[in-house]
Interface confidence: low
């Protein structure tokens, strides 16, 4: 008996073929000995089957001894033997529906679980092996699941069931929802503007959801609220954001924050949480603010920084031009009685710049002034 | 055994929105199709649509533009509104439910149909 | 969509008298037909599934056939609980439409 493997919801053709190259009578039948289909000459006749709407043949073939069975929208309960009887012969076919679907939405959020489900007929014992996008295989019977989903795993997944030697294939386009970053560090002088951008990892047509901002300054006991929003096809609208600071927030994705000032009490740490609709769970990304101030009083040059840097970062003191004057894997350093000229805060890592300020010191009758 | 009711006003003015809920007792409403058919007195039977657990809908075309289906799955219950309504929206209205099976896909479950009259 | 026209719309018969109804579709629906019987005041109740299959629980007096587009419901004997209107409906295409009824009556 010849096996036919078919996917839920194709078309399969199932072939019939006589020894006399023309067209003779024919029957399709199922296992119960239902006509499916045949032909009356060159007419075209449909039994009472539950195929009866799905089932067809293709005339164009008859003359050539070719009596095809096509079954259009497959269904697993279509699984059964098939019998063609011509010239007194009996050919039997049996077709095996299978169908792989992803149990939960196939839009799932980072770090949330993939449950690939096989729909078989029942007496079939298939095998599935499932290739992710990023090359990772993983076997498994009816059910395979994949926990932690992470960014690389969007895309396309390669699904083969195997069953009696034959094989079908499968293609799942799963979307993992997250944001392109997962953290970020905005370095910032004192007084200058900062930007939070919050860029997506994917795309959809219509996005809808809910989001806040919480925010932990470093200098503050407990984390605040900032900013909560609402994002509606991809529109973004405010419903409550703090007096101090006052957030303004970018109508259209990707979402954007803006804090008119950097300033030593914002230094901090935030996360940006992103509810979707009919999603459970949510959305993260972590934002870190370091804020910078380089200041003179009397006879004392001071550059600090505020928020979350790391131990190996190295803040410094410098006459253009010259050597550091003072380097630290600290938070403040300062040069007592410095000398006149264009001084220099740097923070760097690994030689790196990542924040600068300058300030001017005048000659000691003069008051500094910063640029 | 399922147990259908519907419940909902039983005078609408005309031009406003008729809004029907029914309410599933002695069964999930999941894995099935719920509709709503209507009944003008002395007239046949019109179907107006259906909803899916998921929150899928289909509509009677002649309809679509005024119907708006919903699904309360933690209530059990589903909901028809109606908007611009007319006198001759005046009717029975049964929520049913669609069972699928092997060579059968009917109407299985009925309520026992609540009457709506369009009047001033 | 697909119309149903059923005939007739109304009928008179005795009690032990053999009733047949029929049901045309404007288009061939296949074997996809179900009879409904509404009694005055209740919901309809599915008699017949894809057009000949009696549901579980209805006499056998109760019959089918037909297939495509011209379809026939019988009652092979007439008992006074079966007076009431009865309506073929098609589930080949959606929406699902309903033919006029025919309402069955005593003589």
């Known amino acids: 008996k010849k096996v036919v493997l078919g996917k839920k919801g194709d078309t399969v053709e199932l072939t019939c073929t006589a020894s006399q190259k023309k067209s003779i009578q024919f029957h399709w039948k199922n296992s119960n000995q239902i006509k499916i289909l045949g032909n009356q000459g060159s007419f075209l006749t449909k039994g009472p089957s539950k195929l009866n709407d799905r089932a067809d043949s293709r005339r164009s073939l008859w003359d050539q001894g070719n009596f095809p069975l096509i079954i259009k929208n497959l269904k697993i309960e279509d699984s059964d033997t098939y019998i063609c009887e011509v010239e007194d012969q009996k050919e039997e076919v049996q077709l095996l529906v299978f169908g792989l679907t992803a149990n939960s939405d196939t839009h799932l959020l980072q770090g949330q679980s993939l449950t690939l489900t096989l729909e078989s007929p029942p007496g079939s014992s298939p095998s599935v092996q499932c290739r992710s996008p990023r090359g990772k295989n993983i076997q498994g019977g009816k059910t395979l699941s994949v926990s932690q989903l992470e960014l690389q795993d969007s895309g396309t997944w390669t699904c083969t069931v195997l069953q009696n030697q034959k094989k079908v294939e499968f293609k799942i386009d799963i979307v993992v929802l997250a944001f392109q970053k997962a953290s970020s560090i905005v370095y910032k002088k004192e007084g200058e503007q900062v930007e939070f951008s919050f860029p997506l990892a994917f795309t959809v047509e219509k996005l809808t959801g809910s989001g806040e901002l919480w925010w932990q300054a470093e200098r503050a006991s407990s984390s605040k609220s900032w900013i909560t929003f609402d994002l509606k096809n991809k529109e973004v609208s405010v419903k409550r954001v703090t007096q101090d600071p006052k957030l303004q927030m970018g109508k259209k994705l990707p979402l954007h924050l803006t804090l008119p000032q950097a300033l030593p009490q914002y230094a901090g740490s935030g996360n940006l949480t992103l509810a979707l609709e009919a999603k459970t769970g949510k959305l993260h990304q972590e934002v870190n603010l370091v804020v910078m101030r380089a200041t003179q009083l009397q006879k004392n040059l001071t550059c600090e920084v505020w928020g979350p840097t790391s131990p190996k970062l190295m803040l410094s003191l410098k006459l253009e031009n010259k050597e550091a004057k003072v380097s630290k894997r600290e938070k403040a350093v300062w040069v007592l009685n410095p000398e006149a000229g264009m001084w220099q805060c740097l923070l760097s890592d690994s030689g790196q710049v990542l924040l600068e300020s300058n300030i001017k010191v005048l000659p000691t009758w003069s008051t500094p002034v910063q640029p | 055994q399922v147990q259908l009711l519907e419940s909902g006003p039983g005078l609408v003015k005309p031009s406003e929105t008729l809004s029907l809920t029914c309410t599933v007792s002695?069964?999930?409403?999941?894995?099935?199709?719920w509709s709503w058919i209507r009944q003008p007195a002395g007239k046949g039977l019109e179907w107006i649509g259906r909803?899916?657990?998921?929150?899928?809908?289909n509509y009677n075309p002649s309809l679509k533009s005024r119907v708006t289906m919903s699904i309360d799955t933690s209530e059990n219950q589903f909901s028809l509104n109606l908007s611009s309504v007319t006198a001759a929206d005046t009717a029975v209205y049964y929520c049913?439910?669609?069972?699928?099976?092997?060579?059968?896909?009917?109407?299985?479950?009925w309520g026992q149909g609540t009457t709506v009259t369009v009047s001033s | 969509d697909i119309q149903m026209t059923q005939s007739p719309s109304s009928l008179s018969a005795s009690v032990g008298d053999r009733v047949t109804i029929t049901c045309q579709a404007s288009?061939?629906?296949?074997?996809?037909l179900n009879w409904y019987q509404q009694k005055p005041g209740k919901a309809p109740k599915l008699l017949i599934y894809?057009?000949?299959t009696l549901e579980t629980g209805v006499p056998s007096r109760f019959s089918g056939s037909g297939s495509g587009t011209d379809f026939t419901f019988t009652i092979s004997s007439l008992q006074p609980e079966d007076i009431a209107t009865y309506y073929c409906?098609?589930?080949?295409?959606?929406?699902?439409?309903f033919g006029g009824g025919t309402k069955v009556e005593f003589k």
């Open positions: 049913a439910r669609e069972l699928e099976r092997p060579y059968y896909y009917g109407m299985d479950v």
């Open positions: 288009q061939d629906i296949s074997n996809y």
């Open positions: 409906q098609q589930y080949d295409n959606l929406p699902l439409t």
């Open positions: 894809n057009a000949s």
């Open positions: 002695g069964g999930s409403i999941s894995s099935y199709y």
């Open positions: 909803i899916y657990i998921s929150g899928s809908t």
